[in-house]
Interface confidence: medium
Amino acid sequence: MDNQGVIYSDLNLPPNPKRQQRKPKGNKNSILATEQEITYAELNLQKASQDFQGNDKTYHCKDLPSAPEKLIVGILGIICLILMASVVTIVVIPSTLIQRHNNSSLNTRTQKARHCGHCPEEWITYSNSCYYIGKERRTWEESLLACTSKNSSLLSIDNEEEMKFLSIISPSSWIGVFRNSSHHPWVTMNGLAFKHEIKDSDNAELNCAVLQVNRLKSAQCGSSIIYHCKHKL
Amino acid sequence: MAVFKTTLWRLISGTLGIICLSLMSTLGILLKNSFTKLSIEPAFTPGPNIELQKDSDCCSCQEKWVGYRCNCYFISSEQKTWNESRHLCASQKSSLLQLQNTDELDFMSSSQQFYWIGLSYSEEHTAWLWENGSALSQYLFPSFETFNTKNCIAYNPNGNALDESCEDKNRYICKQQLI
């Protein structure tokens, strides 16, 4: 069996890995919505009870003319309506929520479950970054423009672990490292010096960098090579 | 007449007051239950290994796993036997790769490596089965009829599969479905 090149890393399986759990957006918002509804109901409830007590104190045991009594009945009627609305809200909302959750789950499944996190559809996520894994070959400059048009940047490699991961995914691709000539240092897209070894650097015609099976190599900027784009989350 | 009117209004007031009180107690009970329900049963609880991203339409994966189309994949670079691979995936609350279709690992299609997947032959069912017990679709690997049933299956993300001794060591891919 043919083996792909160097990949120096693998899963470290601790006995009890600690993991965070977060709620998905839809449900989190739904829960918040419910809490808001409840808070709203509580406020009305407090207001209603205050009104009720207040009126009770003011008008208790007095032989009143009909107008104030009408007022009391009106206030009590409004309070009843508010309370009924609150009761209906609390009874109906959770079942609606469950229904909405079930529907959204169903919809997500039927939509081929394509979209993940903050990344565009068909991109992959890894370690807080989104990656577009291209299949088209472009020159280095064309690749740079293609990634810009996708609101991202030509693949940058921030650390050794990322390089190892990318080497598993794709044997070779352009990276955002270049030099003006063989007399100039290798720099990243933000103009910082790139300190790591780039193979074949002594060849004056090879001034753009490629990730090739866990190695960084220099290549002719005009060569057509697969490109990948990256966007940090 | 004024006395009758006053009595009538008092009667209505009393009735409404009782209704208000009963509604208030109902509301109190409902509020208590709702809060209890919210704290005990969130609308959706992710599995222990899955870290769901806030503000995410779908999902994010554990560190060092790849998220793609709402699945998480761990792509190993260590070679293991098929059984070892299966246990390693299980220990991460995932399973050896079960393919829905041959473009599932589209993002790895230029890889030349073969990986163990969760397919093995069941003597009992006389069929190639995925780890969850479902049968292999005959359209997935046209060559599956030539597979040696004593062997396990290694898969290359460009769509090829081959059978190898389960004791051979290969890299492997674990998969977690997030929905």
Epitope: M1, Y8, S9, L11, N12, N159, E160, S167, K195, E197 | -
Partner: antibody, heavy 118, light 107 residues
Framework: EVQLVESGGGLVKPGGSLRLSCAAS????????MNWVRQAPGKGLEWVSA????????YYADSVKGRFTISRDNAKNSLYLQMNSLRAEDTAVYYC???????????WGQGTLVTVSS | AIQLTQSPSSLSASVGDRVTITCRAS??????LAWYQQKPGKAPKLLIY???SLKSGVPSRFSGSGSGTDFTLTISSLQPEDFATYYC?????????FGQGTRLEIK
């Protein structure tokens, strides 16, 4: 200048424990995977364990799995190998070696001798 | 694990000779192979990586070739300081493995 200096070797009884250290200098330690390699007297090289730059990925040779633990402290520029349940066959010179972004071991320490004997 | 078999286990040669050492992998490792030189009482020293890439600072008389399962290290013209033990190592996948070594002695 890149320097790796191992320490912590010595004589230990079978079943005993030992902790090796490797002090790194002259490079950005936190950017590199590090490895332990050993060499029994008069024998060849045997890779023992590897740890990636931020400790996310850890590997062991089958012969030491479950007994040895590799770790690192990037703040102290140090690599460690905790060796438990030592056996006579663990007697060797232990080297720490650096990787350059996936290149093989481009720098090695001078080694520290571990002798397991009763 | 991937086994690496070096041949010969030892060889005698003279200064100025051209020497070839081979390393065979039990399965394909593409070009993920390195060669090291070790002198008695010293740590190994990297000579060649990626099967054929010469590490900077290593004399050009050392060269490597091969891909897949068969690899060779060639010393075009032996110098006195080249008498040592040479090891091949695969870094295609874990566990990493070394060949058993080839001892190069003065004839």
């Amino acid at each position: 200048e890149v320097q790796l200096v191992e320490s912590g070797g010595g004589l230990v009884k079978p079943g005993g424990s030992l902790r090796l250290s490797c002090a790194a200098s002259g490079f950005t330690f936190s950017s590199h995977s590090m490895n332990w390699v050993r060499q029994a007297p008069g024998k060849g090289l045997e890779w023992v364990s590897a740890i990636s730059s931020s400790s996310s990925y850890i590997y062991y040779a089958d012969s030491v799995k479950g007994r040895f633990t590799i770790s690192r402290d990037n703040a102290k520029n140090s690599l460690y190998l905790q060796m438990n349940s030592l056996r006579a066959e663990d007697t060797a010179v232990y080297y720490c070696a650096r990787e350059e972004w996936g290149l093989p071991f481009d720098y090695w320490g001078q080694g520290t001798l571990v002798t397991v004997s009763s | 694990a991937i086994q690496l078999t070096q041949s010969p286990s030892s060889l005698s040669a003279s200064v100025g000779d051209r020497v070839t050492i081979t390393c065979r992998a039990s399965q394909g490792i593409n070009s993920a192979l390195a060669w090291y030189q070790q002198k008695p009482g010293k740590a190994p020293k990297l000579l060649i990586y990626d099967a054929s890439s010469l590490k900077s600072g290593v004399p050009s008389r050392f060269s490597g070739s091969g891909s897949g399962t068969d690899f060779t290290l060639t010393i075009s013209s032996l110098q006195p300081e080249d008498f040592a033990t040479y090891y091949c190592q695969q870094f295609n996948s874990y566990p990493l493995t070394f060949g058993q070594g080839t001892r190069l002695e003065i004839k």
